[in-house]
């Protein structure tokens, strides 16, 4: 290499990143292997709970403005849960990123945006709840679904919009033991006239604006929303917390437990710039609370179980419904069965308290599913315990 | 090729000040983080200040900060060292150094003698 | 501040031989390791950078290793040039001090 050529620029903390060798010490090894079952379970776990949550809620409930919030959460988490199995390889391969930097950059993004979006589908939760108790005149005449729909849309494309810095300054660095390194780069895209000055600015900026956007707002908009709930609650003479009251408890409680260290270890990532003293702490700890962040995905369908009463015996009654239809249809290819399937479904859905979402008449199994996904899954109205928890508008 | 060419040395007497330069050429000095480095008369190297490749941030050990201004001036190519309150032990011979990265000095100059002495 | 304690302070080989200097750190220096090569009268010369890894257009005799706050520079097979003062140095946390050098003479 000619001594003119300069090397690929990297900030202070990245470089020494890049200089940390792999041990292959037994126990290190053994932690690696748990690891790697560890965030596989959670891969599974996180794509089937969501998968079903979507369904249950999407396809067999009464649409609300409460289960399309609830709908919007498990979206987010199903995408988040889609990126686990890759994060999972890069750690089955020894920590390695083996597939290249275009997907580096996507997998990092789906991470961000699923925090983007779940802190502020949560503040929109509480507003919403906020609005319905202290304006409910309002509320009554404003709160449809296809508001709510209107209004996830906007909050998606302000976590897509927040997820883009996150996206520009991912890359690709080879560590000098012949490992890739899948992280920031805030030097990647016009680094400046100094260096120095530009990776202690654009670290603290991403570390600040993500602690404050996904974190600390959302946090502050959920307390006072139910800081405004409480008092007018309160001045009603009304105690007893509803059904969706607890879940949106639950689900924030595991928000703020979830990603609270994540931005803790991410604000001290920022100072180790300037602070190299904290950077091995940081390098212990962040891959740990970034797993933690991770398994708020999958935490998050186990809440909306947990805390809607029946919710379990609806959804193994659900599920059972879902397979007997697939088997009654793989059963029954030839024309003649026809009048045996509808009569099938509709003993289904009067079995079920939670209804089928599509009619006889209409497509099965997966062009069902892309029908629900293109918006055309037609709901009917049904008072199960879920649902009653999910379009509770009283609490 | 790569050439840094230190100046600026000489005898100076205790309490007096002096400015060492350091003239690059063969490689795009702004891209690229500088350093002082003095070795005393048959002693080891010590590290003096470092200065990031835009001029923004500098640093300095415990002996030399507040005494001891490292600078830049990127449109001529040049490294500079401002010493104030000049000490017996500051005798040494300075050499500037370029750094390979954040770190590691890949390219030395031949260096230029400062001898503080009344 | 971290001291770097290197050892021997001299030693005397011939060509051929196979030369091993260690440095030693106060802390864990994570890597951030150079080692450099002096002879009388010139500037110094970068060998190793990032404790392991050999800097452009040094002979491959020369290699490094070590982690934490151990770190080694081996000379498979000693040649008449290679006879100088060598320096270890951290980067880890300022100020970035240095050994206080290994002179190898010949024997």
């Known amino acids: 290499m000619s001594a003119n050529a300069t090397l690929k620029p990297l900030c202070p903390i990245l470089e020494q990143m890049s200089r940390l060798q792999s041990h292959s010490n037994t126990s290190i090894r053994y932690i690696d292997h748990a690891a790697v079952l560890l965030h596989g379970l959670a891969s599974l776990l996180g794509l089937v709970e969501n998968g079903v949550i979507l369904f249950v809620v999407g396809c067999r409930m009464r649409q609300t403005v409460v289960t399309t919030w609830v709908l919007h959460l498990a979206l987010s988490d199903l995408l988040a849960s889609a990126s686990l199995p890759f994060f999972t390889y890069f750690l089955a391969v020894g920590h390695s990123w083996e597939l290249g930097t275009t997907f580096c950059k996507l997998h990092s993004s789906i991470f961000f945006l699923n925090m983007f979006a779940s802190g502020f589908l949560l503040s929109a939760i509480s507003l919403d709840r906020c609005l319905q108790v202290v304006r409910p005149v309002w509320a009554q005449n404003h709160r449809t679904v296809a508001a709510a729909h209107k209004v996830c849309l906007v909050l998606w494309a302000l976590a897509v919009l927040n997820t883009v810095p996150y996206f520009v300054f991912r890359d690709t660095i080879s560590r000098l033991d012949g490992r890739i390194m899948c992280y920031y780069n805030v030097l990647l895209l016009n680094p400046g006239p100094d260096r120095d000055a530009t990776c202690n600015s654009r670290q603290a900026a991403l570390a600040v604006s993500k602690f404050l956007l996904a974190f600390l707002v959302p946090l502050a908009i959920i307390a006072s929303s139910h800081a405004a709930v409480s008092l007018r609650l309160q001045h009603r003479g009304r105690r007893r917390p509803g059904r969706f009251v607890r879940l949106v408890a639950a689900v924030v409680a595991a928000f703020a437990l979830c990603w609270g260290p994540y931005h803790v270890f991410s604000l001290l990532e920022a100072r180790a710039h300037a602070n190299p003293g904290l950077r091995p702490l940081v390098w212990r700890g962040l891959p740990f609370v970034t797993s933690l962040a991770f398994f708020n995905s999958v935490a998050n369908p186990v809440l909306y179980v947990l805390t809607c009463p029946d919710m379990l015996r609806k959804l193994r009654r659900s599920l059972r419904t879902v397979l007997e239809s697939v088997l009654v249809d793989d059963s029954e290819l030839g024309g003649a069965g026809s009048s045996r399937r509808r009569r099938t479904s509709s003993t289904a859905r009067s079995a079920s308290p939670l209804a089928l979402c599509s009619r006889p008449e209409e497509p099965r199994g997966p062009a069902r599913l892309l029908g629900w996904l293109l918006g055309s899954c037609a709901a009917s109205p049904q008072t199960g315990p879920l649902n009653r928890a999910l379009s509770s508008t009283s609490s | 090729e790569v050439q840094l060419v230190e100046s600026g040395g000489g005898l100076v007497q205790p309490g007096g000040s002096l400015r060492l330069s350091c003239a690059a050429s063969g490689f795009t000095f702004s891209s690229y983080l500088m350093s002082w480095v003095r070795q005393a008369p048959g002693k080891g190297l010590e590290w003096v200040a470092r200065?990031?490749?835009?001029?923004?941030?500098?640093d300095y050990p415990g002996t030399v900060e507040g005494r001891f201004t490292i600078s830049r001036d990127n449109s001529k190519n040049t490294l500079y060292l401002q010493m104030n309150s000049l000490r017996a032990e500051d005798t040494a011979v300075y050499y500037c150094?370029?750094?390979?990265?954040?770190?590691?000095?890949?390219?030395w100059g031949q260096g230029t003698l400062v001898t503080v002495s009344s | 501040d971290i001291q770097m304690t290197q050892s021997p302070s001299s030693l005397s080989a011939s060509v051929g031989d196979r030369v091993t200097i260690t440095c030693r750190a106060s802390e864990n220096i994570y890597y951030n390791l150079a080692w450099y090569q002096q002879k009388p009268g010139k500037a110094p010369k970068l060998v190793v950078y990032?404790?392991?890894q050999l800097a452009d257009g040094v002979p491959s005799r020369f290699s490094g290793s070590g982690s934490g706050t151990d770190y080694t520079l081996t000379i498979s097979s000693l040649q008449p040039e290679d006879f100088a003062t060598y320096y270890c140095q951290h980067f880890w946390i300022t100020p970035w001090t240095f050994g206080q050098g290994t002179k190898v003479e010949i024997k």
């Open positions: 990032a404790a392991t």
């Open positions: 200065i990031s490749n835009g001029g923004s941030t500098t």
């Open positions: 150094a370029r750094h390979r990265t954040n770190w590691d000095f890949d390219y």
